[in-house]
């Protein structure tokens, strides 16, 4: 008769499956996430907070602050999953936790692909989500500083072209609009002049009612759109780089979550297999 | 260099037809809205007419003293624009400037003016 | 329509001089008000646009200020060239109007 499979003589009854490595590893991980996704959030619920009343007004769907909010707890929830069930050995956890973030890293890696093979659909959307934002630039005060951030820093002007301002209420150029700012354009639009220390935030006015030529001696006549394309084409290195730094911490997680769900398993069946065995004459 | 200039002022009698043009050079004539306005001898300027530009689909806008005797007009392609004057009474006599308009309500080039004389 | 008012239909000053020309409007513009020259040979510029921004190539002698009803036309060192009429005009409503004029004369 052949001879059963034991535990190894030397570690005797106190022998484990799971490494200590392994587990504090993915704990530790985790539990760097699960700080980072509090912070996330209370950084978020902050910016809600503190924003004035007509933010309510505001479109949440182009609130930075409640995209930091809903990334925040998705992140904080599957943390938690990934903290407790490597601190419990709680296989449910763990499996929960490595689906949820394949999941995730598979509609990442989805998204990217179908950025690529439409590029066209995707240049859609991303005209789309700039022209929303120039219709609530003045709704909102942080998507208003990511627009002046934007145009400044890419020395562009509204989404195809400057006159996409007049998609807005307040700058909108129709010669019975009664808001000071008609026809006007953010000051962000404007061209750095080296001799002005102080910027002059009355630059853009009343650019709109200006052809090309005459409005790119003040402005930036450019729009974003095709100037962010052209910055991703230059730039798909880097965002390579983003796109790997996003994807490895996701894909160790993965690979730890499912090592340790292994090693739980066999655990278990180790720990079965001493307890029917007990009485045997042979263990 | 914006230039306006304007023509086809002289004497006529009342209730009759006269059409005056504006050549435009120096910009791009169709992102603009133009304009008349008119100044009798010695009083204040009146603003009279406007066409908008090719984004607003060049509708036009009438003052309530000319509205259904005056028409005006563009031709985008050699950058003219037309005032044709119908029913001409005597209180229609003053000096007729084209204008460049800008949606921020100012005029911001000017002709050098024509003058129109109703008179039997 | 909205009525632009200026009282002063001429003033008389010397070369130098800090003259200041008035305007009122019958409503509220929001700084919609426009100020021209016009010359006595029927030229007209425009000088100054949304109430105190100068228009390219005018002199920074002439500024503007104002709100809501009431603005006014500064030249601060009147010279000869300055001799004229000035109009003020609002654009915050379709018609825009023009003021009277107030004609500006040398001592």
């Known amino acids: 008769m052949a001879r059963r499979p034991r535990a190894p003589a030397a570690s005797g009854e106190e022998f484990s499956f799971v490494s200590p490595l392994v587990k504090y590893l993915l704990f530790f991980f985790n539990m760097l996430f699960w700080v980072i996704s509090m912070v996330m959030v209370a950084v978020g619920v902050y910016a809600r907070l503190m924003k004035h009343a007509e933010a309510a007004l505001a479109c949440l769907a182009v609130d930075p602050a409640i995209l930091l909010i809903v990334v925040g707890v998705l992140m904080f929830l599957l943390t938690f999953c990934g903290c407790i069930g490597s601190l419990r050995e709680n296989i449910c956890l763990l499996q929960t936790f490595s689906l949820c973030l394949t999941a995730v890293f598979l509609l990442q890696l989805a998204a990217g692909i179908l950025g690529f093979v439409f590029s066209d659909k995707a240049r859609g959307k991303v005209s789309e989500i700039i022209n929303n934002a120039i219709v609530h630039y003045r709704d909102d005060l942080d998507l208003q500083n990511l627009i002046d951030f934007g145009q400044k820093k890419f020395s562009c002007c509204g989404g195809i072209s400057y006159k996409d301002w007049s998609q807005n209420m307040y700058f909108n150029c129709s010669e019975d609009n009664p808001s000071r700012e008609r026809c006007s354009v953010p000051y962000s639009c404007c061209l750095p002049t080296p001799d002005q220390a102080v910027i002059n935030t009355m630059c853009g006015q009343g650019m709109q009612a200006f052809d090309y030529l005459e409005a790119s001696k003040v402005i930036y006549t450019n729009g974003c759109i095709d100037k962010l394309v052209n910055w991703i084409h230059s730039n798909l290195f880097l965002l390579g780089g983003v796109a790997l730094g996003l994807a490895i911490p996701q894909l160790v997680g993965i690979l730890l979550s499912q090592i340790l769900v292994n090693q739980i398993k066999d655990q278990i069946k180790l720990q079965l297999y001493n307890q029917q065995h007990r009485a045997d004459p042979w263990y | 260099e914006v230039k306006l200039v304007e023509s086809g002022g002289g004497l006529v009698q009342p209730g009759g037809s006269l059409s005056l043009s504006c050549a435009a050079s120096?910009?791009?004539?169709?992102?603009?809205?133009m304009t008349w306005v008119r100044q009798p001898p010695g009083k204040a300027l009146e603003w009279l007419v406007f066409i908008r530009n090719k984004a607003n689909g060049y509708t036009t806008e009438y003052s309530a003293s000319v509205k259904g005797r005056f028409t005006i007009s563009r031709d985008n392609s050699q950058s003219i624009l037309y005032l044709q004057m119908n029913a001409l009474r005597a209180e229609d006599s003053a000096t007729y400037y084209c204008a460049r308009y800008l949606q921020t309500g100012n005029f911001d080039y000017w002709g050098q003016g024509t003058t129109l004389t109703v008179s039997s | 329509e909205i009525q632009m008012i200026q009282t002063t239909s001429s003033l008389t000053a010397s070369l130098g001089d800090r003259v200041t020309i008035s305007c009122r409007a019958s409503q509220d513009i929001s700084n919609f008000l426009n100020w021209y020259q016009q010359k006595p040979d029927g030229t007209i510029k425009l000088l100054i646009y949304?109430?105190?921004r100068l228009h390219s190539g005018v002199p920074s002698r002439f500024s503007g200020s104002g709100s809501g009803t009431d603005y006014s036309l500064t030249i601060s060192n009147l010279e000869q060239e300055d001799i004229a009429t000035y109009f003020c005009q609002q654009g915050y409503t379709v018609p825009p109007t023009f003021g009277g004029g107030t004609k500006l004369e040398i001592k």
């Open positions: 120096g910009f791009t004539f169709t992102d603009y809205y």
């Open positions: 949304f109430t105190s």
